[in-house]
């Protein structure tokens, strides 16, 4: 399976929600010794592979933020720990998952990594990622409300083994 | 890795200057760029900075006087109606986990003087 | 904002224990916004810790950042005479235009 990133680039202004969007493509094995993991964290941009640091959202980790379902099944986080954190992520049963950030702040700008992992009992597991940039302005350049830019479709394949 | 700021000299009050900040080994559309001065045995204050977008935000007291522009391996700041409590080294820093603040990478500074 | 330091000089001995305080008027970002730097006379500012606890790379381990919201702490153990120097907290607020840095804390070994 791939994960795509519909959008590389999202610009959005101070205060402004914004959900940031990956989706699973390809055969998705939905056997009972199949489970999907997935989870949303921070990394830096510049590193020579892309999405390999892991860093927090708003304090939360990569832990903190994961759904864990098999298959296609639709899922949330535990609301209370994100909400708190303005944060939310979700997974449908199309195989699009998200997190949704609210009331955007400048440091929330930076390059935020979606993450798959396949886990098969007793065999090995198999991870993709994908990863877009988010970034938040205020002031006369500002927009008035998210802007989306969407990736290549190269990008929007991205199956970096992590 | 590198960042370098260079166009520090001695000024008369009001005279306008830019200092330029030069980076290499890195791209300027991957990392934000933040300003910090120092004046002569005082502590660090933090001027602005630049996103990855190009927007640039400031620090209340540098706002309509300081202006923060870049090109594709450099940052300028651009300094209008100089005092002498301008009299200050100028660091120009790369900001590595975009915030405005965490500068990881940083140049040697740059003297600007402003006397009469 | 404002961040108040520990005042300076603080001295140490060679192979003892310092600790240097931040205190901010208001929270920072996330609660953890926060970095230590390190500056010795005539030289640019050094990144040690960001997010208030985590260390920069090649610092020393000897370095530790610890708190949340607005009380912070840099602890230096194992203290060298290399460690002299004068080191800053700074912070990053939801409102960048709160952005400050500590007014500087002077370590001195002994």
């Known amino acids: 399976f791939k994960v795509a990133t519909p959008y590389s680039l999202y610009v959005c202004p101070e205060g402004q929600n914004v959900t940031l969007t990956c989706r699973l493509l390809g055969p998705v094995d939905k056997g009972h010794d199949v489970t999907f993991y997935k989870t949303w964290y921070r990394s830096s941009r510049g590193e020579v592979q892309t999405c390999s640091e892991r860093r927090p959202i708003r304090n939360l980790t990569f832990q903190d933020l994961h759904l864990h379902h098999g298959g296609h099944q639709a899922a949330n986080t535990s609301h209370d720990l994100a909400q708190r954190h303005g944060l939310e992520s979700a997974s449908d049963h199309h195989g699009n998952f998200s997190i949704t950030m609210r009331n955007l702040t400048l440091l929330d700008s930076g390059l935020y990594c979606c993450l798959v992992v396949e886990i098969r009992h007793h065999h090995s597991e198999h991870r993709v990622h994908g990863a877009m940039e988010l970034q938040v302005q205020t002031g006369k350049d500002a927009p008035s409300n998210c802007v989306v830019y969407p990736s290549s479709s190269q990008d929007s394949e991205n199956i970096t083994a992590a | 890795q590198s960042v370098e700021e260079s166009g520090g000299r001695l000024v008369t009050p009001g005279t306008p200057l830019t200092l330029t900040c030069t980076v290499s080994?890195?791209?300027?559309?991957?990392?934000?760029m933040i300003w910090v001065r120092q004046a002569p045995g005082e502590g660090l204050e933090w001027i602005g900075f630049i996103n990855t977008g190009g927007s640039a935000y400031y620090a209340s007291w540098a706002k309509g006087r300081f202006t923060i522009s870049r090109t594709s391996t450099t940052v300028d700041l651009k300094m209008t109606s100089l005092t002498t409590e301008d009299t200050a080294t100028y660091f120009c820093?790369?900001?590595?986990?975009?915030?405005?603040?965490?500068?990881?990478?940083w140049g040697p500074g740059t003297l600007v003087t402003v006397s009469s | 904002a404002v961040l108040t330091q520990t005042p300076s000089p603080v001295s140490a001995a060679v192979g003892g224990t310092v600790s240097i305080s931040c205190q901010s008027s208001k929270s920072v970002s996330d609660n953890n916004w926060l970095s230590w730097y390190q500056q010795k006379p005539g030289q640019r500012p050094k990144l040690l810790i960001f997010?208030?606890?985590t260390l920069a790379s090649g610092v020393p381990s000897r370095f530790k950042g610890s708190g949340s919201g607005t009380q912070f702490t840099l602890t230096i153990s194992d203290v060298q005479c290399d460690d002299a120097a004068t080191y800053y907290c700074a912070g990053a607020y939801t409102n960048y235009n709160d952005n400050a840095f500590g007014g500087g804390t002077e370590v001195v070994v002994k």
């Open positions: 997010y208030a606890s």
């Open positions: 080994g890195f791209s300027l559309i991957s990392y934000w």
């Open positions: 820093a790369r900001a590595r986990y975009d915030s405005y603040i965490t500068g990881d990478l």
